[in-house]
């Protein structure tokens, strides 16, 4: 069987939801010594980056300027060390936002509820769309989808303090082209005293998985790598 290197990790820097005409940055984290990284869009080659010097950095950043609906979709990356290629990374969905109009978001029965009450978010957008998306700030990967002509419902079930936080909704024209975000609606859940200390607070930082962790190799890392190599040989 054909030998391949481990698959790289693909990430969006700061967020995978990029306003139209703004720049998107995707990171491909592979391995030290990789001489070439390729970014693929919808299965086709989109961009190539060659790190300098390759042995000193474990990945690259791909900058996608002037985001639009034609550049929104599924991205993946691969890398090469010598003649050997890696497996393809997982797919990353890159979304363009701020298309067309702004939806409105309301919550029922209201923004202040008690633990155990059932909550429903309602998102409305008058322009033609059929899919609506609800996101909790700090949890932007946990997208809820709902369908409707001009508005959609997002039933939450009986809530706990874990549901508290700020929510926004989008109208979606396709999977990768979203409207402007609605104004945020802050849900406050009281009660559920035994869980209060464990309840998440509103994160003011971006999602932790939406950061690029590319590192430059230091002398210490080289020493550790050499020590690890020696230890492996001793074990053999």
């Amino acid at each position: 069987p054909k030998q391949t290197l481990p698959k790289p990790i693909i990430r969006a820097e700061s967020t995978y939801m990029v306003p139209k005409e703004k720049q998107a940055t995707l990171c491909c984290q592979g391995s030290y010594g990789a001489v070439e990284y390729q970014l693929h869009f919808e299965g086709s080659l989109f961009a190539v980056e060659r790190p300098k010097p390759p042995e000193r950095i474990n990945g690259v950043k791909f900058h996608i300027p002037d985001m639009n609906s034609r550049k929104a979709g599924r991205y993946s990356c691969i890398y090469r060390v010598g003649e050997l290629w890696s497996e393809r990374s997982d797919l990353l969905d890159l979304v363009v936002t701020e298309m067309y109009d702004t939806p409105t978001l309301s919550v029922h029965p209201g923004p202040e509820v008690t633990s155990g009450e059932k909550v429903t978010f309602y998102c409305r957008l008058d322009t033609a769309t059929s899919m609506f998306l609800l996101l909790k700030e700090g949890r932007s990967r946990d997208v809820q989808r709902s369908y409707g002509k001009v508005q959609a419902e997002f039933p939450m079930g009986p809530v706990t303090t874990a549901h508290r936080g700020s929510y926004r909704c989008f109208g979606s024209y396709n999977n990768y082209a979203w409207s402007f975000p609605s104004e945020p609606v802050k849900l406050l859940v009281t009660g559920d005293i035994e869980n209060t200390s464990l309840a998440p607070t509103d994160p003011t930082f971006p999602d932790s998985w939406d950061t690029c962790l590319l590192t430059r190799e230091t002398g210490l890392q080289k020493d550790l790598a050499l020590w690890d190599h020696t230890a492996q040989n001793l074990l053999r």
Partner: antibody, heavy 115, light 107 residues
Framework: QVQLQQPGAELVKPGASVKLSCKAS????????MNWVKQRPGQGLEWIGM????????NYNEKFKSQATLTVDKSSSTAYMQLSSLTSEDSAVYYC????????WGQGTTLTVSS | DIQMTQSPSSLSASLGERVTLTCRAS??????LNWLQQEPDGTIKRLIY???SLDSGVPKRFSGSRSGSDYSLTISSLESEDFVDYYC?????????FGSGTKLEIK
């Protein structure tokens, strides 16, 4: 204090339409859902629908969807319900009630449909 | 639609007596249940929201509780003004639905 003012009575002919009003005061009108509820003489309560004045989001009971239209006028803090193609079955008391939890209720408007 | 089965439909009781009204929900409604009081002139007032929270200004003799899908309103010691109609209301899932009502009469 929160108040929801409704006209005491309306008399209309069968086949006509009527627009019932509910004037809110004592709170921020655009911050709360407004519900409409029907009660026929000697009967129980039926939810017609609700509207959020801030977003114009509406939600109707399917039973009333073709007949009732909910609107608001933010400038006067007034919610409206238009009922069309009226029959004697629509003779009832109609209440408006604030909030998703129905915390404050109007006094109700008695609608009589009669020729 | 969620059915709210309210019982009893009428109840005769004496001043000072303790009474309990019940509503059974046909589907899960969590704690999204109100108890309403309707005067003979049609005035409607909310007594209890979120199953067990007492509205401000409502006497402490009124209390709400839940056991599974059964929701109860208890009046610990009846007073003369309590002899009116009572309704439960679920606001968990639209269409929001009411119980058929309980007429509380003086014995």
């Amino acid at each position: 204090q929160v108040q929801l003012q409704q006209p005491g009575a309306e008399l209309v002919k069968p086949g006509a339409s009527v627009k019932l009003s509910c004037k809110a005061s004592g709170y921020t009108f655009t911050s709360y859902w407004m519900n409409w509820v029907k009660q026929r003489p000697g009967q129980g309560l039926e939810w017609i629908g609700m509207i959020h004045p801030n977003s114009d989001i509406t939600n109707y009971n399917e039973k009333f969807k073709s007949q009732a239209t909910l609107t608001v006028d933010k400038s006067s803090s007034t919610a409206y319900m238009q009922l069309s193609s009226l029959t004697s079955e629509d003779s009832a008391v109609y209440y408006c009630a604030r909030h998703g939890r129905f915390d404050y209720w109007g006094q109700g408007t008695t609608l009589t449909v009669s020729s | 639609d969620i059915q709210m089965t309210q019982s009893p439909s009428s109840l005769s009781a004496s001043l000072g007596e303790r009474v309990t009204l019940t509503c059974r929900a046909s589907q899960d409604i969590g704690s999204s249940l109100n108890w309403l009081q309707q005067e003979p002139d049609g005035t409607i007032k909310r007594l209890i929201y979120a199953t067990s929270s007492l509205d401000s200004g409502v006497p402490k003799r009124f209390s709400g509780s839940r056991s599974g899908s059964d929701y109860s309103l208890t009046i610990s010691s009846l007073e003369s003004e309590d002899f009116v109609d009572y309704y439960c209301l679920q606001y968990a899932s639209s269409p929001f639905t009411f119980g058929s009502g309980t007429k509380l009469e003086i014995k």
